[in-house]
């Protein structure tokens, strides 16, 4: 069970032996920031490999990551958030590979939450609202949100709407009547900070009203 069958281990050309990627989360636990790294190659033997960050730190020169299963993690208040840090993969004292990274450019926001959809009968629309912990943060406050929705039977036909607020109105006439919809939302930094999409929020499911035959309008649920 240790390797791939057929011709031994695979060598996928685009994967460098020790290539890795990282993301930061600012004020993720009170005033503490976090940095999470992992190897891109799933076949790397990580047994004796460690990660270290040096530079652009407050009060200390370097910090070591904790290994959590197969990822590497730091939670600290000591990120300066100005300039680049050097993140290295190490075996003992020897550095195998390093990357200079500005932690403000690899920010992954926390996932939005409390997503809900309310039908307004008089307005013939659906009001989508959600919450984000970033409204309370000092640093990563400005986000772009990606709301994605689909008819539940359409496996991959997602409609995406980008918005900067946490409220969206969907017109009833743009949706199929008497159908079950799935909706979810994610966020990405949109101002000074740069980085990656958050994880998706948990999905919310809602049903559109049926069409009222006499008026051609949908019935409320």
């Amino acid at each position: 069970e240790s390797g791939y069958a057929q011709n031994g281990d695979l060598e996928d050309a685009e994967l460098d032996d020790y290539s890795f990627s990282c993301y930061s989360q600012l004020e993720v636990n009170g005033s503490q920031h976090s940095l999470t790294c992992a190897f891109e190659d799933p076949d790397v033997n990580i047994t004796n490999l460690e990660f270290e960050i040096c530079g652009a730190l407050v009060e200390v020169k370097c910090l070591n990551f904790r290994k959590l299963q197969e990822i590497y993690f730091i939670e600290t208040k000591k990120f300066l958030l100005i300039g680049k840090s050097n993140i290295c993969v190490k075996v003992g004292e020897k550095s195998l590979t390093c990357k200079k990274i500005d932690l403000t450019t690899i920010v992954k926001p926390e996932a939005p939450f409390d997503l809900s959809v309310v039908y307004r009968e008089g307005a013939n629309d659906f009001v989508v609202t959600f919450n984000t912990s970033h409204l309370q943060k000092k640093y990563v406050k400005v986000l772009m949100h990606d709301v994605a929705y689909r008819q539940e039977k359409d496996e991959n036909k997602w409609t995406h709407v980008n918005l900067s607020s946490t409220k969206l109105t969907l017109l009833q006439r743009k949706l199929q009547p008497a159908a079950m919809y799935e909706i979810k939302v994610r966020s990405i930094p949109d101002h000074y900070f740069k980085g990656f999409w958050s994880e998706w929020s948990p999905s919310y499911y809602f049903r559109t009203p049926e069409i009222n035959n006499s008026s051609g309008e949908m019935d409320p649920i």
């Epitope: 069970e1 996928d12 994967l15 290539s19 990627s21 993301y23 992992a38 190897f39 891109e40 190659d41 799933p42 076949d43 959590l68 299963q69 197969e70 990822i71």
Partner: nanobody
């Protein structure tokens, strides 16, 4: 305890497609390298594809390269295997599990994929 529930298998003609899913629980999915394995009748279980914790790196067995795509959704603790251009020799029970297995790691029930005309 660790639970792995595979689904999405079925009977398909050569050249057809299937998408397998695996729902994982009982461990921190986002911290683990995850893999799909398969076992054909009378053969040993073999490693088919693996994906890094963030989903940004993948590896495939030579026999499925260019046809299969492994992906993951850490928010849902779900692992996927998109299988295109299926061949007779892809017939097997497919299992998901951690890439780096420990002796104590349990297996799910698997999902049967049968390629037949």
């Amino acid at each position: 305890q660790v639970q792995l529930v595979e689904s999405g298998g079925g009977l398909v003609q050569p050249g057809g497609s299937l998408r397998l899913s695996c729902a994982a629980s009982g461990f921190t999915f986002s911290q683990r390298i995850m893999s799909w394995y398969r076992q054909a009748p009378g053969k040993e279980r073999e490693l088919v594809a693996s994906v890094s914790p963030f989903g940004d790196g993948t590896r495939y067995a030579d026999s499925v390269k260019g046809r299969f795509t492994i992906s993951r959704d850490n928010a849902k603790s779900q692992l996927y295997l998109q299988m295109n251009n299926l061949k007779f020799e892809d017939t097997a029970v497919y299992y998901c599990n951690k890439r780096n297995l420990e002796i104590s790691d349990a297996w799910g029930q698997g999902t049967q994929v049968t390629v037949s005309s």
